[in-house]
């Protein structure tokens, strides 16, 4: 069945029951999620707007799917598997009496159920299993999840130690001065130049020393971590964003709505699911996309690709390539594309590498 | 390449039955719920049956509950929909359509085939 | 139970226009609407999903928005192959339709 191909999951509670006070709902959803945090690498993060990738939901009856509720007692709750719209969406029947204790129906306990469906479980037949298909009360002091819940949900995605194959284990800042640090996505933003790590970017004014790291979720609460390719069009004051098959219009600095969007509007073939880097060229008009060993030039102002593409990255950027991380346009002449840990300034009018530096190098390490 | 090909579809008299079958092919059948949507001539679209992956659970439009049920055989990747005590009202071009979702439905369907018509008169 | 209620039921434009149609359901539906386009003796094609996400292989000149109740598909600048009937759709229930006609 479906999973979410990411570590990093954002929920949003849409709507409050009002059998419970707003913070105990809160907590018992929060402590639903840590459940399965504590035995997988996933990370959940509570977002208050825009489009999160689980949506909790309180409603009665009809309510927007084809699985009406049917009262008190019967379907508590439901919920969709992992993917894109109502995919990961938890549904919990308001003609229930929901609680914090044995009386009614303890919310956490549903919860925890409910947010194993979002991931991707389906039931158990343990009975001592969370995912049993049943509810039964237990003391939720004591509560633990079965062998099995554990079983299943590693089966999805690991345990918390794969933590540590991933390139931020613990969700904490990377060490900017690392020799061996390497960038997710790298643009310029006016004078400013960003680039991507994960959850983070640092923030280079030009010619200032200084740098300053930020969570992306702290400027644009609606983007995801891990962007993976970023290009700007000053004269528009538009930065886009991308990450998988998806990407994101930020104009002056704040997101646009009805994003995001399929990078397969740009006229990419199906089988490209993902952009590695991208670059503007305001001399030319012309947007460079990096996938995998190749590269696509898409007319800005035509709002289509260039013919002829796409072509191979080494045959064009020499010395560049087969696969590139990240790349930015700089002083009208020059692309600085990153390749793990190593940066090389390429001159595109001379079309040859004039320099090359460490990733960080513009840290002052 | 999905693909669904309908058929089954034909001149049918009131009080009459017809089956209709979707083939499919392209993607994996089994996961997916699968569903039949109808449009009367010159009219809009009309959800009339959904069946879950496994048959287990099957939802009907209420203009035709008690008289179609729908039916999938996973191994031979094809949906089913028996029409019985057909009506003139029935008449309409019936489409097969994918879910994108397999436990619950979504209800969203990102793949349908050409349709078959259904005339339903005497 | 649940109703959707699509406007205007038909509309003319002219190539290069901005078209906006809208979809209404009488109670909250979250963000669980879809649009689909349908040209004369043709399938429908999905073209937003979740009310603003853009199906693969589609333009980017189509784009929905809404939560809630109230919806809308935007077409920024129409095009020739854009004049067709389109559907909002909420789980099993669809819309009336919008039919886009050249002025």
């Known amino acids: 069945g479906p999973v979410w191909r990411k570590h990093y999951i954002t929920y949003r509670i849409n709507n409050y029951t009002p059998d419970m006070n707003r913070e105990d709902v809160d907590y018992a959803i929060r402590k639903a999620f840590q459940v399965w945090s504590n035995v997988t690498p996933l990370k959940f993060s509570k977002i208050n707007t825009g489009m999160a990738d689980i949506l909790v939901v309180f409603a009665r009856g009809a309510h927007g799917d084809f699985h009406a509720f049917d009262g008190k007692g019967g379907i508590l709750a439901h919920a969709f598997g992992p993917g894109s719209g109502i995919g990961g969406d938890a549904h919990f029947d308001e003609d229930e009496f929901w609680t914090t204790h044995s009386g009614g129906t303890n919310l956490f306990l549903t919860a925890v159920h409910e947010i194993g469906h979002s991931l991707g479980l389906g039931h158990s037949s343990d009975p001592k299993a969370v995912m049993f298909p049943t509810y039964k009360y237990v003391d939720i002091n004591t509560f633990r999840l079965s062998a099995d819940d554990i079983r299943g949900i590693q089966s999805l995605y690991g345990d918390p130690k794969e933590n540590q194959r991933l390139p931020n284990p613990d969700n904490s800042e990377p060490a900017l001065c690392d020799p061996n640090l390497s960038f997710d996505a790298v643009t310029t933003v006016g004078n400013k130049i960003f680039f991507f790590k994960d959850r983070f970017f640092w923030l280079k004014v030009s010619e200032r020393p200084k740098t300053s790291v930020n969570l992306i979720s702290s400027l644009w609460p609606t983007l995801p971590s891990g962007i993976e390719a970023a290009y700007e069009i000053e004269a528009r004051n538009q930065v886009f964003l991308f990450k998988d098959d998806k990407y994101w219009l930020i104009s002056n600095l704040r997101p646009e709505p009805n994003y995001p969007k399929s990078i397969h509007s740009f006229g990419f073939p199906n089988f490209v699911k993902k952009i590695d880097a991208a670059v503007f060229n305001p001399r030319f008009y012309r947007t460079y996309f990096f996938v995998d060993n190749q590269y696509w030039r898409y007319d800005e102002r035509r709002q289509m690709m260039d013919p002829g593409y796409p072509k191979l990255i080494t045959k064009n950027f020499q010395g560049i390539g087969p696969k590139i991380d990240a790349v930015f346009y700089s002083k009208n002449k020059y692309y600085y594309f990153f390749q793990g840990s190593n940066q090389f300034e390429y001159d595109f009018l001379l079309q040859r590498i004039t320099k090359t530096l460490k990733s960080n190098s513009w840290f002052g390490c | 390449e999905v693909q669904l090909l309908e058929s089954g579809g034909g001149l049918v008299q009131p009080g009459g039955s017809l089956r209709l079958s979707c083939a499919a092919s392209?993607?994996?059948?089994?996961?997916?719920?699968m569903h039949w949507v109808r449009q009367a001539p010159g009219k809009g679209l009309e959800w009339v049956s959904g069946i879950s992956p496994s048959g287990g659970n099957t939802l009907y439009a209420d203009s035709v509950k008690g008289r179609f049920t729908i039916s999938r055989d996973n191994s031979k990747n094809t949906l089913y929909l028996q029409m019985n005590s057909l009506r003139a009202e029935d008449t309409a071009v019936y489409y097969c359509a994918k879910d994108i979702r397999g436990a619950y439905s979504s209800g969203l369907f990102d793949y349908w085939g050409r349709g078959t018509l259904v005339t339903v008169s005497s | 139970d649940i109703q959707m209620t699509q406007s205007p039921s038909s509309l003319s434009a002219s190539v290069g226009d901005r078209v906006t149609i809208t979809c209404r359901a009488n109670q909250s539906i979250y963000t669980y609407l879809n649009w689909y386009q349908q040209k004369p003796g043709k399938a429908p094609e999905l073209l937003i999903y979740a009310a603003s996400s853009l199906q693969s292989g589609v333009p980017s000149r189509f784009s929905g928005s809404g939560s809630g109740t109230d919806f809308t598909l935007t077409i920024s600048s129409l095009q020739p192959e854009d004049f067709a009937t389109y559907y909002c759709q909420q789980a099993g229930i669809f819309g009336q339709g919008t039919k886009l006609e050249i002025k």
């Open positions: 392209g993607f994996t059948f089994s996961p997916y719920w």
